[in-house]
């Protein structure tokens, strides 16, 4: 159950997909990846106020308990709900190979 | 790829399973659940330092970019890797029913 998509904190403040440009050096990949030289990393960033994009029952519980015990139970967290695959051209012992990673780029986001 | 399980912040400080006792009132369930009266909610709480229990490649990227741009990219977050099902005895219009929820109690945790 994905709950409300209305952000009470104002536009763009709640959990959503962001794109961050990163070089191979930024990612610590320069020694094992040849291409791409730069990655448009899509990731989930933003606040998870009460019931906003709640991923499941667990997220709803977490929201309730965070309201009661904010020092003990953290608020739900903005994380990927699914991923887009990406191919990397990797260095190998003998040359290069193509490797597709299914869990590299966030496709959409929810709170959990 | 689940990376290191050694917590550099000290015992129990990093992402792990915690149990929080909660009443139906705490959870906001009193009007639709009969049993259990109290739930031992297992949830994922704790810090996600570099590569600790990294769920996947995306988590590793997030760690690298958080180190570079801490104000823009948040650290990975401690969330359930899997769930334990739980049955609730629910009130219905005509009486009660049993309903199993697969996404209510965290079973184990990782950082993402």
């Amino acid at each position: 159950a994905r709950n409300g998509d209305h952000c009470p904190l104002g536009p763009g403040r709640c959990c959503r997909l962001h794109t961050v440009r990163a070089s191979l050096e930024d990612l610590g990949w320069a020694d094992w990846v040849l291409s791409p030289r730069e990655v448009q990393v899509t990731m989930c960033i933003g606040a998870c106020p009460s019931q906003f994009r709640a991923a499941n029952m667990h997220a709803q519980i977490k929201t309730s308990l965070h309201r009661l015990k904010p020092d003990t139970v953290p608020a739900p967290c903005c994380v990927p709900a699914s991923y887009n695959p990406m191919v990397l051209i990797q260095k190998t012992d003998t040359g290069v190979s193509l490797q597709t990673y299914d869990d590299l780029l966030a496709k959409d986001c929810h709170c959990i | 790829a689940r990376n290191g399980d050694h917590c550099p912040l000290g015992p129990g400080r990093c992402c792990r399973l915690h149990t929080v006792r909660a009443s139906l009132e705490d959870l906001g369930w009193a009007d639709w659940v009969l049993s259990p009266r109290e739930v031992q909610v297992t949830m994922c709480i704790g810090a996600c330092p570099s590569q600790f229990r990294a769920a996947n490649m995306h988590a590793q990227i997030k760690t690298s970019l958080h180190r570079l741009k801490p104000d823009t990219v948040p650290a990975p977050c401690c969330v359930p890797a899997s769930y334990n099902p739980m049955v609730l005895i629910q009130k219905t219009d005509t009486g009660v029913s049993l309903q199993t929820y697969d996404d209510l109690l965290a079973k184990d945790c990782h950082c993402i």
Epitope: S35, P36, M86, L88, I89, V96, T100 | -
Partner: antibody
């Protein structure tokens, strides 16, 4: 494994439009970094890149031929089409469909021969 | 556009020989160069990526080097199956190929 299969008319008349189709398997064009391109080789000559289409629907064309080329994709069928308008005898060639990974022509189809003649 | 000039255009050699093919770019292309092998009646096959990295399954006798404008493909000890045409290609801007080097049995 990656497979690319070109299909075309074999013979086209001058001034007509050449339509080619590439059917591919073993990879997804929705994967970031993937693309499919077309390269041709006139008889006894070298290789010439024509066009390619990328995972994000970006299309690139050889500037010398851009006004005559159209590339498109049908992701549901794993097919790429190329149209070359106003053909002449100089367009007689083997046309290859190629899988791209980022900027690399990683895998090539067997090619389809196209002759332009009246 | 960036021109890629290969030399020689054809070359005769014997099994066991060491062979070097060169490719010169009309402007700096960094290491954005690939090499392909084409046997008669077949489609080209990827050999080298990023100037010096062998594609999967390519024997170690093939090696590439260079950066900027000058690139080489070396076959350290020719095997019978290596007689073919070789093409360099740059991908620094829109892709262009060299005219090819035909490697024949002496």
């Amino acid at each position: 494994q990656v497979q690319l299969q070109e299909s075309g008319p074999g013979l086209v008349k001058p001034s007509e439009t050449l339509s080619l189709t590439c059917t591919f398997s073993g990879f997804s064009l929705s994967t970031s970094g993937m693309g499919v391109g077309w390269i041709r080789q006139p008889p006894g000559k070298g290789l010439e890149w024509l066009a390619h289409i990328l995972w994000d629907d970006v299309k690139r064309y050889n500037p010398a031929l851009k006004s005559r080329l159209t590339i498109s994709k049908d992701s549901s069928k794993s097919q790429i089409s190329l149209k070359l308008s106003s053909v002449t005898a100089a367009d007689t060639a083997v046309y290859y469909c190629v899988q791209m990974a980022w900027d690399w022509f990683a895998y090539w189809g067997q090619g389809t021969t196209v002759t332009v003649s009246s | 556009d960036i021109q890629m000039t290969q030399s020689p255009s054809s070359l005769s050699a014997s099994v066991g020989d060491r062979v070097t093919i060169t490719c010169k770019a009309s402007q700096n292309v960094d290491t954005n160069v690939a090499w392909y092998q084409q046997k008669p009646g077949q489609s080209p096959k990827a050999l080298i990526y990023s100037a010096s990295y062998r594609s999967s399954g390519v024997p170690s006798r093939f090696s590439g080097s260079g950066s900027g404008t000058d690139f080489t493909l070396t076959i350290s000890s020719l095997q019978p199956e290596d007689f073919a045409t070789y093409y360099c290609q740059q991908y620094h801007s829109y892709p262009t190929f060299g005219q090819g080097t035909r490697l024949e049995i002496k």
